[in-house]
């Protein structure tokens, strides 16, 4: 086992919430069996750890939310990988296992006396980010009636409550964006469309939903293809030639694709001289990512994409951008991250990394090239959901009592799940957070359009929205050319 | 939690092997969350439990195999369901968890003394039967370096050692039968073929392999369709009409299907008057099952199917058929099974079931309507594989020593895995058991043909074999008509 994964961020409290964030990148193929993770991550990792710590501080200082009860946490690193996340989840449930070992008399003291435990059980888990990892974690957590609230796992499979009863999410299922894509196709009377999807759960289930819904609307999916994100040039060329063979009839290409699949298509368009021949309609794997279009803007022009609605959270930046390694000691990964971010050595610090020659100077600040994690609002909403669920449960089980009454010791996961499913509150961006019977949240998307804004200057602009079934589009903006 | 699942079959020994068998049917949809299993099973359940117990007796009394070491077991019920199997697997690994709790000082005695454990750790696990369940179990076991040997989980996904390092099987991957099906298509120069597969892992991955291999061989898969086994009449009719529309060119239909999907197709053929128009080539989901063709024999005539080679094991029947509830007390499910099998009440027994009115009489015998589990040979080979792996490990770690030397206390799962992967021995049916680099066993299949043997008498007959890449077919037998 790799020692870095043993690191845990703890914050004490009357009730402990677990969290799984991808503090490090996933293990490379040769390191998978050791479960040795990759480099530290800022957006998907450190920022989320800090969001958890700071959000709990905010909740604990809010007199209207869980009065007389402090929330603590145990944050673990999933490394965006099933095996690592599962191993860490076992740490979460260790306590439940040991308590039942004692019940069954499998742990005994040498002198026959009873043993005691030194760790509070986890009542719920926030995360992890990836759907396939979340599925594995849920398989384990549900055995112990531990609710799980995800902030970015959007796979349709997770809506199946017979399989994933204790799973909820503050993001919609991908079925919603499939619907949004169909609604766009309908709006512009595109009756003959080619389709591409990325191999794997995200692309396959998303495209299946898109095709089913299209069929019901009388839209002909002329031809459908799939490709791996990491496929070679030849595979992408072959695919483009197939799409080309259906021109000019099937000019629209619906792509339920990861970002790197879209990039592969754009690169093949360049090689085959096909810029401008297709109109790409992309799912949120593309969204408004510059790493998808960088260097291939001309091929991407006109693309219409779906993006999950999540404005930046200002108060998080106010907190985060002030953090420094000499004072932020509660985040056990922070020094490692600081050195990685600024490629320098924190001399004299516990986690000093000698691989960096340059010493970190005191003028460094996180404001430099700062980009807030695009899912920040969802992460915070997931934490607040857990707090509101516990609050409602306390109100119902301990009427007229401030704090944890006996009826909440220990916390019953089944009751907490019921309470969470009924939760609704105003989220961090002012939108209503609530859960349907499948534990899913409403679909709210922005519709983006990739345009040439001026000579050799390209950008994504917001041309519409899709909110829980209602599509609004600025048609003039979609079809206008900027660079006249 | 349902109490029946807490039942465990134990057999003491120096080394304990875990096993997961589907002693009960899977929970019905309304019982899934309680993980309350269905009725007791004979072939897939009780027979496999008895096979484990009796095979270990045979191994323990064999002076040449693990001399001075007794093998014991802990058999648990998977109920053919992921959540149940995962819960049971946690019981297997509890011990590892507790030992590390102690290392980390999380379990302490009131007086500060050390705790001790009263249960031997499991060194490996046999089973479970289903691929999707085996995947879940493997995800957990590999975290603790516990090798798993499966006897009927054939999904191609399980060959991926980056994902499933500690997984091995005495059955081939479905990629092999896909290859066998392609070889049959090639042999008869069928260049234009329609394809059908059952929705789900088995059908999808199998058909994908079949299509990839066909393409390489220049075989045109004209049209490819998928359907759920439990789809309605209309869905099957619709599919048959699509297949019909490609007649007479695409008369061969390759079906990588579960048995009930094939049955659905046969029933639709009856409704649409299409008996005899197609030649079905079926995977081992059909094999030689009468429950697939029953009542629809005329539609199935000519079908060529793949069946895993596994002759009955005579010595198992010699043992099993003598078992009686008053003497077979080591199998904790046996009384429940006996009452279910004979629909009677075992009066005065511990597990007497009052739902049966009739009392079981002493003349009852398992010989009545006995059918040996079709996978029996594989179950036994899996157990022997574990024994030979441990034997070879002992020979290498404890040279010149009979019994467990210190180098094997505790048993290191990584070393055991290495030893298992190198294992080869003569299996229960006289064939060589060995594992390739993916932990898979060679593909050995029988080719069956469903024929009209006389007026209104139909049966499967063996018309060939496919052994590790070599197809042998009795062409005259395939194309002859019996009922002249």
């Amino acid at each position: 086992q790799s020692s870095e994964r043993r690191v845990v961020a703890h914050m004490p409290g009357d009730i402990i919430i677990g969290a799984l964030f991808s503090v490090h990148h996933q293990p490379t193929v040769d390191k998978v069996h050791e479960r040795k993770c990759g480099a530290v991550r800022e957006q998907y990792g450190i920022q989320r750890v800090e969001a958890m710590l700071h959000t709990l501080e905010r909740i604990n200082s809010d007199p209207t939310l869980l009065p007389n009860i402090t929330l603590g946490c145990e944050i673990r690193d999933s490394c965006w990988h099933s095996a690592v996340a599962l191993e860490q989840s076992i740490e979460f449930i260790r306590d439940s296992l040991i308590s039942s070992e004692e019940e069954e008399g499998l742990v005994r003291c040498v002198d026959g006396s009873s043993s005691f435990r030194s760790k509070k059980p986890i009542v719920g888990v926030i995360g992890p980010g990836s759907s396939s990892v979340a599925i594995q974690v849920q398989n384990l957590l549900q055995l112990f009636n531990i609710p799980q609230i995800a902030y970015s796992a959007t796979s349709m499979d997770l809506s199946d409550k017979t399989l994933f009863k204790y799973f909820m999410r503050v993001v919609p299922s991908d079925a919603q964006q499939a619907r949004a894509m169909v609604d766009i196709v309908k709006r512009y009377n595109w009756t003959y469309v080619s389709a591409v999807h990325t191999e794997g759960n995200y692309g396959e289930s998303g495209m299946e939903a898109f095709k089913d819904m299209s069929a019901k609307e009388g839209i002909c999916i002329a031809h459908s293809y799939k490709i791996y994100s990491n496929a070679g040039e030849q595979s992408f060329d072959k695919l483009l030639k197939k799409l080309r063979s259906h021109l000019p009839k099937a000019r629209v290409v619906a792509c339920f694709c990861e970002g790197m699949t879209v990039r592969g298509l754009l690169m093949a368009m360049r090689r085959l001289g096909l810029a401008g021949e297709f109109l790409l309609l992309g799912s949120d794997g593309w969204a408004d990512r510059y790493d998808v279009t960088d260097g291939y803007q001309r091929e991407a022009v006109g693309g219409i994409t779906i993006k999950l609605q999540s404005p930046d959270v200002k108060w998080f930046d106010d907190y985060y951008l002030k953090l420094r390694p000499e004072t932020n000691l509660r985040n056990p990964w922070f020094q490692e991250f600081w050195q990685h971010r600024f490629q320098c050595r924190l001399e004299g610090f516990a986690q000093e990394n000698s691989k960096y020659n340059k010493t970190c100077n005191s003028s460094l600040t996180l404001r430099t090239h700062h980009v807030q994690d695009s899912k920040m609002g969802f992460v915070i909403n997931a934490i607040y959901s857990m707090a509101y669920g516990l609050h409602n449960m306390q109100m119902s089980l301990c009427p007229g009592y401030a704090g944890l009454c006996d009826a909440m010791k220990p916390i019953d996961g089944r009751k907490l799940l019921d309470s969470l499913m009924k939760t609704n509150f105003t989220g961090v961006s002012g939108d209503m957070i609530l859960f349907d019977e499948n534990g899913d949240s409403p679909g709210r998307y922005e519709i983006m359009n990739f345009k040439e804004m001026g000579k050799d200057y390209f950008d994504y602009i917001n041309v519409g929205s899709w909110d829980n079934g209602e599509l609004k589009m600025d048609d003039d903006e979609v079809w206008s050319k900027k660079n006249n | 939690q349902s109490s029946e699942r807490r039942v465990v079959a134990h057999m003491p020994g120096d080394i304990i092997i875990g096993a997961l068998f589907s002693v009960h049917h899977q929970p019905t949809v309304d019982k899934v969350h309680e993980r309350k299993c269905g009725a007791v099973r004979e072939q897939y359940g009780i027979q496999r439990v008895e096979a484990m117990l009796h095979t270990l007796e045979r191994i323990n009394s064999d002076p040449t195999l693990l001399p001075n070491i007794t093998l014991g077991c802990e058999i648990r019920d998977s109920c053919w369901h992921s959540a149940v199997a995962l819960e049971q697997s946690i019981e297997f690994i509890r011990d590892s968890l507790i030992s590390s709790e102690e290392e980390e000082g999380l379990v302490r005695c009131v007086d500060g003394s050390s705790s001790f454990r009263s249960k031997k750790p499991i060194v490996g696990v046999i089973g479970p039967g289903s691929s999707s369940v085996a995947i879940q179990v493997q995800n957990l076991l590999q975290l603790f370096n516990i090798p798993q040997i499966a006897y009927s989980a054939t999904s191609m996904d399980l060959s991926d050692k980056t994902l499933f390092k500690y997984f091995m099987r005495v059955v081939p991957s479905d990629a092999q039968q896909a290859r066998a099906m392609v070889d049959i298509v090639k042999r008869y120069n069928w260049t234009y073929v329609s394809a059908v597969h059952t929705e789900g892992n088995y059908g999808e991955s199998g058909m994908e392999a079949f299509k990839d291999m066909s393409a390489k061989e220049g075989i045109c898969i004209a049209h490819s369709y998928k359907i759920y086994s439990n789809a309605g009449e209309q869905s099957f009719d619709k599919l048959l009409k699509k297949l019909r529309s490609h007649l007479p060119k695409a008369r061969v239909v390759a079906c990588f299907c579960e048995g009930m999907t094939v049955r659905g197709l046969l029933m639709a053929m009856r409704r649409l008057g299409l008996a005899g128009e197609f030649l079905l080539l079926g995977s081992d989901g059909w094999a030689d099952r009468y429950d697939v063709t029953d009542g629809y024999q005329r539609e199935a005539v000519g079908g060529i199917t793949i069946k895993l080679q596994s002759p009955d094991v005579k010595w198992f029947d010699d043992y099993y058929l003598k078992l009686r509830p008053e003497t077979n007390l080591r199998n904790p499910w046996f009384q429940e099974f006996w009452q279910h099998r004979f629909q009677c009440r075992l009066e005065g027994f511990a597990q007497e079931n009052s739902k049966y009115n009739k009392t079981c009489n002493s003349s009852l015998t398992l010989r009545t309507h006995h059918v040996q589990d079709s996978k029996m040979g594989f179950v036994i080979n899996a157990i022997y594989s574990m024994a030979y792996g441990l034997h070879n490990m002992q020979m290498s770690l404890c040279p010149g020593y009979a019994g467990l030397c210190d180098a094997m206390k505790p048993i290191d799962g990584r070393k055991l895995l290495d030893s298992l992967m190198k294992t080869n021995f003569t299996g229960v049916s006289g064939d060589m058991i060995l594992f390739d680099e993916n932990g898979d066993s060679p593909g050995r299949y029988e080719i069956m043909n469903f024929k009209e043997m006389g007026k209104d008498y139909f049966d499967y007959i063996n018309v060939g074999s496919w052994d590790n890449g070599e197809l042998k077919m009795d062409d005259d037998e395939v194309w002859s008509k019996k009922n002249n």
């Epitope: - | 009449e233 007649l247 007479p248 128009e277």
Partner: antibody, heavy 121, light 106 residues
Framework: QEQLVESGGGLVQPEGSLTLTCTAS?????????MCWVRQAPGKGLEWIAC???????TWYANWAKGRFTISKTSSTTVTLQMTSLTAADTAAYRC??????????????WGQGTLVTVSS | ALVMTQTPSSVSAAVGGTVTINCQAS??????LAWYQQKPGQRPKLLIY???DLASGVSSRVKGSGSGTEFTLTISDLECADAATYYC????????FGGGTEVVVK
Amino acid sequence: QEQLVESGGGLVQPEGSLTLTCTASGIDFSSGYFMCWVRQAPGKGLEWIACISPYSDNTWYANWAKGRFTISKTSSTTVTLQMTSLTAADTAAYRCARTMAIGAYNPFKLWGQGTLVTVSS
Amino acid sequence: ALVMTQTPSSVSAAVGGTVTINCQASQNIYSNLAWYQQKPGQRPKLLIYDASDLASGVSSRVKGSGSGTEFTLTISDLECADAATYYCQGYYSGNAFGGGTEVVVK
């Protein structure tokens, strides 16, 4: 041009037998469409009798026709209907028809003009 | 066995009018139903298949509808040439014709 022509009809004694022939021209049996027989008693409705697959030679019959009527393919362009134990109730115009799609249970796309069978003493 | 019941046995309507013929199946046949027109001394002519699809060369005045066990043939803007007997045929788990409906155009 696709055409079906029936022959072999006429007067037959009760309990007698008769074989009708349907000859196809301009039709390729290898296209797989099924050939069937349908009858129509004078002033009455249509009644399906039987169908045959040109590929497998499998046959399908109406329940009432089983045992007395036999459909068979005698060449790549002819189909016959053998009728035994005839009674007055079998008096009808017998038409040959080709299915619209492959399969015994289908609409009939092409019809012959019919041949009259009269069962009388 | 599949049985088809057709109603009415006879119907008359004026030129330019509309007639509706019903057909009931003894079991669920989904959309596996055809309609034919037959004039005296002529062979039957396929009008509709799969309950609502128009056979080639058939006037769009002819419309089929229904599924399961209840089906309808509607002929609008009646012409003299529409005078004939109309038959339904169920083709699912067997072939069976309805008894026929004579349409008289006045």
